[in-house]
């Protein structure tokens, strides 16, 4: 049966009708509307935008649209006491100061409430000392410094370039190395693509441009003062000393003009190799401290930001399902921005707006989806995924029983080269089938499918003729749904050519120059890539909410489980002596994966054959599919990360943005050769193999015949 028959609607109200209703011109109009003033979390402007979106979603035809508010810990610069960094001479005089703001882009000179660049949640402080250049401040960069170069960062101010990993991991690494302050800067090697002009003449970062961002290490906790529970009116709040994930040393971001002034004087050790050199005309010496002529000069940080409990607002829209109203498909993306949010988040919010409008149009014509669709405009994503996490904490019992899928909708573009998808393996076939039905917007692929252009430009490293689909990591609002609650999740956006553009993210990320004009002039003048992303995100939501049998293929999970087991096994076997000494066996894990593969195969056969006209059997099979992702959740969570509970995937402990497979085993093996007590360390590896094997076996059994 078609999904139309399931909801007794006329055949014209199918996926095609929904997709045909999506218009590039509307997305363009919505983006313009959302980007004219800043919408920083916790501000009046962002509250007003929440109310506007609520009103418009109601007009579009949703059944209900409510604001859900929480009082969470946010962070702001002190308006009268600005943050900056100085070079001071031996007398303590400031002989150089970094800029206090970014020069505003043309047309925005008179806009008020542009928050100056700052590292959200930095503690206050005025540390001074010698500088050490720590490259990207990754785990391996500190290993190189401390173990190979014997450079001690204790009591030093470190300067790190943005890129490669989440900034919060950089700060955590610097803290562990004993640093007393961190300066983050954007190097042109990472944020200035060759042959492209700086904004406003191109999409590159000017020397005065600075990346804002939070520097928390929340590990999925949400509001730092109410981990595990919603920050509601009767919440019990921790004291600031017990808050989750706050940095303990001052941190501040700068642009490459200011970085040049700090780095050009660096002395001490030469960079260990070319991978430590950026594109500035400086030696990239590691330090510590400045060269001979300047050796008496020091660096001083002046940080006066404050942490404040502030009200935030999510917008939650509901389109009730006609047949299974107690099954929820969620489309969510954030609304808060650092400044104008031209790309992050409003290129995503504009797409969500148009998707809501299209669904609303169908609903006004008498159509309803089979399952309930929830639409969310999250607040305070930039401050640690706070809005989505608090809402999920408040509604966790409903979500764990009723949540079918979550589709994320942050930035629709980070380039205009090809599609990028990260999702649960359960959604691979859905994404493949959908993209085969959509037209490619790419030049040279006229009349070809999106699947074809995507596969050509971004081929899978494992399977020929298929596109690359990546693991979910974190750093966005799907985190609580996937990593904590085990709800099947996915995200899609248009991206750059990673082979030719090795800079991190897009150059103007989180700067004042992320404007409507950036998108309209340089990234997507016809808004055709935005439209394609709307079709992918909207199409996924439509299918998930409307297909009679959920469009999940459990066999694809079996394939990746074997791949991940092979990978973690090979990492472990790099230590053959210890493997032998401690009798480390992977038999249980491979056996569980084998069982999962066989049971998934049998389940898929039953799925083809069962009587879809029997609503009880249909619901039973769909529930087995819905709850499969849930079965990978360990209620105890990962070691020291209780809110990361998915046993197959977690954000990397070294880079929140990246996903790691079998993270419990991976972390137990990481740097194991340096552990003081090898017997204990290998015991933990064995325990993690046991947890993983048990979880895979338990998940397999949820797919077995029920009786």
């Amino acid at each position: 049966k078609s999904s139309n028959e399931a909801t007794n609607i006329t055949p014209k109200h199918n996926m095609k009708a929904f997709l045909d209703e999506l218009k590039a011109e509307n997305i363009k109009k919505f983006l313009y509307n959302f980007t004219q003033i800043p919408h920083l979390a916790g501000t009046e402007q962002n509250f007003q935008l929440a109310k506007q979106i609520q009103s418009q979603w109601k007009e579009f035809g949703l059944d209900s649209v409510e604001l859900a508010h929480y009082d969470v810990l946010l962070s702001y610069p002190n308006k009268t006491h600005p943050n900056y960094i100085s070079i001071i001479n031996e007398d303590g005089n400031e002989i150089f100061n970094t800029s206090l703001f970014e020069p505003p882009p043309p047309g925005y000179e008179n806009v008020s409430d542009i928050v100056p660049p700052f590292s959200a949640f930095s503690p206050q402080g005025m540390p001074e000392g010698d500088l050490v250049y720590v490259n990207y401040a990754r785990t391996e960069d500190f290993f190189k410094l401390e173990r190979d170069m014997k450079i001690n960062c204790s009591g030093k101010i470190v300067i790190a370039r943005y890129g490669k990993v989440f900034r919060g991991n950089k700060v955590k690494n610097a803290q562990l190395a004993g640093a007393k302050g961190v300066i983050l800067y954007s190097d042109p090697a990472d944020y200035f693509a060759p042959g492209v002009k700086s904004y406003p003449d191109g999409w590159n970062l000017p020397g005065g441009g600075v990346q804002r961002g939070n520097i928390l290490n929340l590990n999925g906790a949400g509001d730092p003062l109410t981990p595990g529970y919603p920050a509601n009116e009767y919440a019990y709040r921790r004291g600031i000393a017990e808050a989750v994930g706050l940095p303990s040393i001052p941190v501040h971001p700068i642009g490459y003009y200011d970085a040049q002034k700090l780095l050009e004087k660096m002395g001490g050790s030469a960079p260990p190799d070319s991978s430590w050199r950026g594109s500035l005309k400086v030696p990239y010496n590691v330090g510590p401290g400045f060269t001979g002529n300047f050796s008496t000069q020091k660096v001083k940080m002046h940080i006066h930001s404050t942490n404040e409990v502030t009200r935030i607002y999510n917008v939650i829209g509901t389109l009730r399902g006609a047949v299974e109203p107690d099954r929820y498909v969620i489309l969510g993306g954030h609304r808060d921005s650092w400044v104008f949010g031209g790309i992050d988040p409003q290129s995503g919010a504009a797409v969500v707006h148009e998707i809501v409008r299209s669904f609303g149009t169908l609903k006004k014509e008498g159509w309803r989806p089979r399952r309930t669709i929830l639409f969310a405009s999250w607040d305070a994503e930039e401050f640690g995924l706070l809005g989505s996490t608090e809402w999920a904490e408040e509604n966790s019992r409903l979500l764990q029983e009723r949540g079918v899928a979550y589709i994320n909708a942050d930035s629709s573009i980070e380039g205009n080269y090809t599609l990028r998808v990260d999702c649960t393996p359960l959604m691979y076939s859905l994404v493949h089938n959908l993209t085969k039905e959509l037209k490619s917007p790419d030049e040279g692929f006229e009349g070809k499918s999106l699947y074809e252009s995507w596969t050509k430009k971004s081929p899978s490293p494992e399977f020929s003729g298929m596109p690359r689909i990546s693991k979910l990591g974190s750093g966005n609002d799907f985190e609580v749904f996937f990593q904590r609650l085990g709800i099947a999740s996915g995200r899609a956006r248009y991206t750059k050519n990673w082979e030719t553009n090795k800079f991190s993210g897009y150059p103007l990320y989180h700067s004042v120059y992320e404007t409507y004009e950036l998108v309209e002039k340089f990234y997507d003048p016809m808004f055709k890539y935005h439209l394609t992303v709307a079709q992918v995100r909207g199409g996924m939501v439509f299918e998930l909410a409307n297909s009679i049998v959920l469009p999940f293929d459990c066999r694809d999970y079996a394939v990746v489980l074997r791949k991940y087991a092979d990978k973690i096994y090979s990492i472990s076997m790099k230590h053959p002596q210890e493997m032998k000494t401690y009798s480390v066996s992977f038999d249980s894990l491979f056996s569980a994966v084998k069982n999962f593969t066989e049971i998934a195969s049998k389940f898929s056969e039953r799925l083809q054959d069962f009587d879809k006209s029997n609503p009880i059997v249909l619901r039973m099979m769909n529930d087995q599919l819905m709850f499969l992702e849930r079965a990978f959740i360990d209620p105890l969570g990962l070691p020291d990360r209780p809110f990361y509970r998915h046993v197959i995937y977690a954000p990397s402990s070294h880079n929140k943005y990246a996903g790691e497979s079998f993270p419990g085993i991976y972390d137990a093996l990481f740097d194991i050769e340096s552990k003081v007590d090898p017997s204990k360390a290998w015991g933990e590896v064995k325990r993690q193999i046991y947890v993983a094997a048990f979880t895979v076996q338990a998940a397999a059994e949820t797919l077995s015949e029920v009786a």
């Epitope: 791949k563 092979d566 096994y569 090979s570 210890e578 401690y582 480390v584 066996s585 992977f586």
Partner: nanobody
């Protein structure tokens, strides 16, 4: 009971080639990743290569010279060793993990 039996070792000149085999029994061979590990005279165990279900992994010291493969229908693991060097001299073990190992086969690279 798991059994792993290596063969194919011997004396070979530098620059020469050898192909090691490992016959496996007592378990469903195709469902498990397998490895080659070696021990040079007077040295500790060194991981050489692993193979899963189509995925292969190599130590930097052998990358581009050695190729691991498997024939699931024969329950056999292979290691094709080309451009052999004196430092490749070692006893080569077939290993299922830390518990199940073969008895090893000696490879000597010498002129």
């Amino acid at each position: 009971e798991v059994q792993l039996v290596e063969s194919g070792g011997g004396l070979v000149q530098p620059g020469g080639s050898l192909r090691l085999s490992c016959a496996a029994s007592g378990f469903t061979f195709s469902s498990y990743a397998m490895s080659w590990v070696r021990q040079a005279p007077g040295k500790g165990l060194e991981w050489v290569s692993s193979i899963g279900d189509g995925t292969t992994y190599y130590a930097d010291s052998v990358k581009g010279r050695f190729t691991i493969s498997r024939d699931n229908s024969k329950s056999t693991l292979y290691l094709q060793m080309n451009s052999l060097r004196a430092e490749d001299t070692a006893v080569y073990y077939c290993a299922k993990d830390g518990v199940h190992w073969g008895q090893g086969t000696l490879v000597t690279v010498s002129s």
